[in-house]
């Protein structure tokens, strides 16, 4: 057959679905690779073809759309499983073509099993809630398009293994789960199971997400430099190692980039000739406030180095701060023999 623009295996779209549940998978061509949508392609006389390579096989084969109860079907640019089976796992390809044009992309589909508490190899999305911030909601994700608006599904929410009922501050409200006042104890995995009827059958959609309670923007402050500070003086003799830690506390801020850097005489360490190394470590509190420590190290400090200005800088979405380290050369202790000789006027 003639050439086909092959976008390869789109591993960015590692699709995971639960066994025995419906799955609707859109052909990624129209979402990520082509500049037109399915309707435009269809009206232009292009045909969408699906095929797959099952797990641990090399052979591409057509998808069987003649299974009992139309278990696998295609609707426009969507491949439907009603429901999935474990051995549906494999690489799926959608190809758009006519006599003069061809474009295709493959993507991996993994059908996974869950245990009795909804644990599975599924990668879970993380939803962050602000601590003690008032009412916040999470919504059962990725259930659009599975049933028409005329169908009223039932939704059951779980925290870990347990149905959410009679919780003090967590209330199920259909597709939403409301947290009246989020606390650290609300951290965990939350699962919604949506049950709906279709053509005389009952289907279930299980969606699990991780809730992480984080620092509230109400409590956020600009970066705080704990070290260097005015109480510690770095007094060194030439030839000794100089170690200066810069320790900065950052309040949690959604999507904020936290930065810490040193300047020496107003320049970045990379831009000067001294042999400086900087090591960084990061730790987080339970609410994802961040403490960054950058240790500036000069193995064998010179008297010139001890006259320089060492400034620690920090920046977040809340502001920028800087603090200079107090560095000085240690005055050598008087040597007794020399002082005595000088005292007697020796030459």
């Amino acid at each position: 057959s003639e050439r086909c623009d092959d976008w390869g295996l789109d591993t960015m779209r590692q699709i995971q679905v639960f066994e025995d549940e419906p799955a609707r998978i859109k052909c990624p061509l129209f979402e990520h690779f082509l500049k037109f949508n399915y309707s435009t392609a269809h009206s232009a006389g292009l045909t969408l073809i699906w095929y797959w390579t099952r797990q641990d096989r090399d052979l591409e084969e057509p998808i069987n759309f003649r299974l009992p109860e139309n278990r696998i079907s295609k609707e426009k640019d969507v491949l439907w499983f009603r429901p999935t089976l474990l051995n549906d796992t494999g690489n799926y390809t959608c190809m758009l073509r006519n006599t003069t044009y061809c474009s295709k992309v493959a993507f991996p589909l993994e059908v996974v099993q869950k245990d009795s508490c909804f644990n599975s190899p599924m990668k879970l999305p993380v939803h962050k809630l602000y601590i003690e911030y008032g009412i916040q909601r999470i919504t059962c994700p990725n259930v659009d398009g599975y049933f028409p608006s005329s169908v009223k599904p039932t939704i059951t929410w779980y925290m870990g293994c347990y149905k959410i009922q009679n919780f003090n501050n967590v209330i199920p409200e259909g597709m939403n789960l409301s947290f009246l006042i989020a606390l650290i104890s609300n951290n965990g995995n939350y699962t919604c199971v949506v049950t709906y009827p279709e053509n005389g059958r009952t289907f279930h959609l299980t969606r699990t997400l991780t809730v992480k309670v984080v620092g509230s923007p109400k409590n956020a402050v600009p970066p705080v430099i704990h070290s260097p500070n005015d109480h510690v003086v770095y007094e060194k003799e030439p030839g000794e190692e100089l170690l200066i830690p810069c320790t900065v506390y950052f309040s949690f801020l959604m999507d904020s980039r936290n930065e810490v850097w040193w300047t020496i005489d107003g320049k970045k360490p990379d831009d000067i000739t001294i042999d400086v190394t900087i090591n960084e470590s990061i730790s987080h509190s339970r609410t994802e406030d961040e403490t960054r420590t950058q240790i500036l190290s000069i193995k064998k400090v010179t008297s010139e180095d001890l006259k320089r200005s060492y400034v620690c800088h920090a920046r977040s979405a809340k502001g920028e701060v800087a603090k200079a380290a107090k560095v000085k050369q240690k005055v050598p202790a008087p040597r007794y023999t020399v002082e005595l000789a000088c005292g007697f006027g020796a030459t």
Partner: antibody
Framework: QVQLVQSGAEVKKPGSSVKVSCKAS????????MNWVRQAPGQGLEWMGR????????HYAQKFQGRVTLTADKSTSTAYMELSSLRSEDTAVYYC??????????WGQGTLVTVSS | DIQMTQSPSSLSASVGDRVTITCSAS??????LNWYQQKPGKAPKLLIH???GLHAGVPSRFSGSGSGTDYTLTISSLQPEDVATYYC?????????FGGGTKVEIK
């Protein structure tokens, strides 16, 4: 379509054990709960316990704890309920019932167990 | 264990009648209530889950409602094939428990 086919009727002596099987088809056996419910002649329904074949997790009603054992064989998609130390009050129809969550969506046809000396 | 009390224990009604069966729990069950239908000599069948969710394939003349401790199953227009015993079942807290059943007959 979901089908649960149970083993045939049993007549047992008091003090003995009975093991009832329930063969499942038409759904992913590992991913649903299998419940066991019994019904004494002319009486209501009584939940005994359940098993999740995927990980073997079980829950039992206090009344049957220690006397009932639920197991599942994933390779044959078959669930088993064994009831020991039988007494005449255990004469009943025993049902298996599959539930993706907690409701029992589909039931087996039932197995009559008669305990008589 | 949560006790489930059903009433009436039996009723007789004419074809086309509206029939109501109630179920009361000994404590709040947060809508975690199912209704099952059992015809003579047959296994039970799920009619309604989570108080009001009609199970697939169940005729729309069956409906459920309620909250807290009190729940209702309604048959809007009784049909001859509805002759059966109806059971409520709570699944709020293990062990799951059933009501005593309501036998529905045709006059």
């Amino acid at each position: 379509q979901v089908q649960l086919v149970q083993s045939g009727a049993e007549v047992k002596k008091p003090g003995s054990s009975v093991k009832v099987s329930c063969k499942a088809s038409g759904y992913a056996f590992s991913s649903s709960w299998m419940n066991w419910v019994r019904q004494a002649p002319g009486q209501g329904l009584e939940w005994m316990g359940r098993i999740y074949p995927g990980d073997g997790n079980t829950h039992y009603a206090q009344k049957f704890q220690g006397r009932v054992t639920l197991t599942a064989d994933k390779s044959t998609s078959t669930a088993y309920m064994e009831l020991s130390s039988l007494r005449s009050e255990d004469t009943a129809v025993y049902y298996c019932g599959e539930g993706y969550l907690d409701p029992m969506d589909y039931w087996g046809q039932g197995t009559l167990v008669t305990v008589s000396s | 264990d949560i006790q489930m009390t059903q009433s009436p224990s039996s009723l007789s009604a004419s074809v086309g009648d509206r029939v109501t069966i109630t179920c009361s729990a000994s404590q709040g069950i947060n809508n975690y209530l199912n209704w099952y239908q059992q015809k003579p000599g047959k296994a039970p069948k799920l009619l309604i889950h989570y108080t009001s969710g009609l199970h697939a394939g169940v005729p729309s003349r069956f409906s459920g409602s309620g909250s807290g401790t009190d729940y209702t199953l309604t048959i809007s227009s009784l049909q001859p094939e509805d002759v059966a015993t109806y059971y409520c079942q709570q699944y709020s807290i293990l062990p799951w428990t059933f009501g005593g059943g309501t036998k529905v007959e045709i006059k």
